[in-house]
Amino acid sequence: IPAPSIRLVPPYPSSQEDPIHIACMAPGNFPGANFTLYRGGQVVQLLQAPTDQRGVTFNLSGGSSKAPGGPFHCQYGVLGELNQSQLSDLSEPVNVSFPVPTW
């Protein structure tokens, strides 16, 4: 099944202490999906979209960006025929970067 879209939700972090907000959206015909956020292949957080919604926002507290392991991806799962779970492809990566201090 198709990969979700992924994007940072503003405000964008300006330091490692700032929270990070990441939105994942399934295609319109997959509402109520279960979403998983990964960083460098490691599960960061799981969220289920409401039954009438096709997306979620992962809210990560400040300091989450210090964890090693590369960019964020997300994936969603839905129940297919015979109640079997189907997983989507992984989203494109999203990288979190911080402005270079000006002092």
């Epitope: 939700v9 503003p10 405000p11 202490e17 939105a23 919604q53 096709r54 507290s61 400040g62």
Partner: antibody, heavy 122, light 111 residues
Framework: QVTLKESGPALVTPTQNLTLTCTVS??????????WGWIRQPPGKGLEWIGS???????YYNPSLKSRVTISVDTSKNQFSLKLSSVTAADTAVYYC??????????????WGQGTLVTVSS | QSVLTQPPSVSGAPRQRVTISCSGS????????VNWYQHPPGKAPKLLIY???LLPSGVSDRFSGSKSGTSASLAISGLQSEDEADYYC???????????FGTGTKLTVLG
Amino acid sequence: QVTLKESGPALVTPTQNLTLTCTVSGGSISSSSYYWGWIRQPPGKGLEWIGSIYYSGSTYYNPSLKSRVTISVDTSKNQFSLKLSSVTAADTAVYYCARRRNSSGWFYFDYWGQGTLVTVSS
Amino acid sequence: QSVLTQPPSVSGAPRQRVTISCSGSRSNIGDNAVNWYQHPPGKAPKLLIYYDDLLPSGVSDRFSGSKSGTSASLAISGLQSEDEADYYCATWDDSLNGHVFGTGTKLTVLG
């Protein structure tokens, strides 16, 4: 049911500082799903976003007001506050506090206070 | 000066349909989702539409939103007297790094 209520002076003298407080009832200010913001409406004009704060203390401000604005949060009192320095008559407005919810892949202001009119005059 | 432009006023008779436009640029509407707020006189603003076209629970389905490129629209069908209010589009502006509201549109229900 979440309610927000603004409190503070109705009249401020030019060059003075304005401090407003928003008290949140019916929900925790410390949820990771919300920012808490201030928005104002000068008489006869439109809505203008002032700035917002996360429960952890992270803030972001309207660039046009940034040099004069400080927003702080007191999670123990379930309150957040706005301080606007060196006010002028142009700061006369109805000031609203509001909750910004992160949900469904985006965000929106879903709960608002009733607003408080602040007049800057000598 | 708002970066989102709306018509100052629109009007319509009861049961008619009106639309309110909101024009921006790539850094705001073009790359970010749009919300709409209803602001009745003397009251707090109320969320009407979020994520371009989604309806919050409790909001009448007479309201609908759409977006194309760097413009967004709010449509109100079956106009009622209680729809009289100011309406604002709102989004994020990546260049300003902040929330922006439209200039606002006053809706008058005739008769």
